[in-house]
Interface confidence: medium
Amino acid sequence: QEEDLPRPSISAEPGTVIPLGSHVTFVCRGPVGVQTFRLERESRSTYNDTEDVSQASPSESEARFRIDSVSEGNAGPYRCIYYKPPKWSEQSDYLELLVKETSGGPDSPDTEPGSSAGPTQRPSDNSHNEHAPASQGLKAEHLY
């Protein structure tokens, strides 16, 4: 029996509380060899795929999904999933994005510190060889 795929993790930079109009980047991480990362947005059942995958460390790969100007419509839960041939992984935990109106006060920070959900070294629900060529993947619906 081949090894289970580790679950992906998801984090947000610079954090999960973002002022209206500011940018946020979701970072999805998984093992080396990931071909496609998918960022899925729960509230609208939409997702965005990327094959722009980089190596974050000797044992990790990552993909970054940037929203240039956050609106109230971008608020909500997000999660990651990845395709490492020939299998898809389980989904990461949810990460909640909060959008706040800019107060402009000197005492209020623009963002919360970086936040993340889900370890990368837990097994996915993939104890068998699940055949899912990326070419079979559905066309991405854009998140923004």
Epitope: E42, D93, R122, D125, E130
Partner: antibody, heavy 114, light 113 residues
Framework: SSSVEESEGRLVTPGTPLTLTCTVS????????MGWVRQAPGEGLEWIGT??????TYYASWAKGRFTISKTSSTTVDLMMTSLTTEDTATYFC?????????WGPGTLVTISS | ELVMTQTPASVEAAVGGTVTIKCQAS??????LAWYQQKPGQPPKLLIY???ALASGVSSRFKGSGSGSDFTLTISDLECADAATYYC???????????????FGGGTEVEIK
Amino acid sequence: SSSVEESEGRLVTPGTPLTLTCTVSGFSLSSYTMGWVRQAPGEGLEWIGTTSNDGSTYYASWAKGRFTISKTSSTTVDLMMTSLTTEDTATYFCVRGTNIRSLWGPGTLVTISS
Amino acid sequence: ELVMTQTPASVEAAVGGTVTIKCQASQSIGSNLAWYQQKPGQPPKLLIYLASALASGVSSRFKGSGSGSDFTLTISDLECADAATYYCQCTYGSSNNNNYGDPFGGGTEVEIK
């Protein structure tokens, strides 16, 4: 290899509470969502609820209040059922996963009869 | 709560033929849909996950397609062993932010003649 198995089914009278136990092996419950599904004789599959790896639980609207799912150890997940009626007679399945539910128990028959 | 509507309830087809089963969600679920095959006295067997991904050990004669709220399972080159009941299921997974649940469709009984 990984496996899940439900405890032996029972014949109980209406109103009697009953707990089914799902015992897992070959993987850690701390990494997986586990769910319960049932199937009345000759009928279709019916989702009861799930407990996620972080311990959160979610239920079908009809199951809320009468059914409780909990991880009781590192290898067991319980389904506690109350106020049982003859309508709850079914085979109960334990299943692992969220988007990839390839691991099912064989099922256990629960009969509610007076 | 999400409702999955599966059609037809039953279908009869010849060996070598093709069967198409449809599943409609009452709201969009992205690609979070699974298809199962169940034979009497057995638990369901996963055929397709994430709408179009073929599960381990499953023949490529089974093909899943669709996204959003409309999904299809196509079984081609039918064999006698394909006689079974087929179910779709939303696999979105619940959270504090949704009440989708993970409901099943009503099932489609496939008879091979």
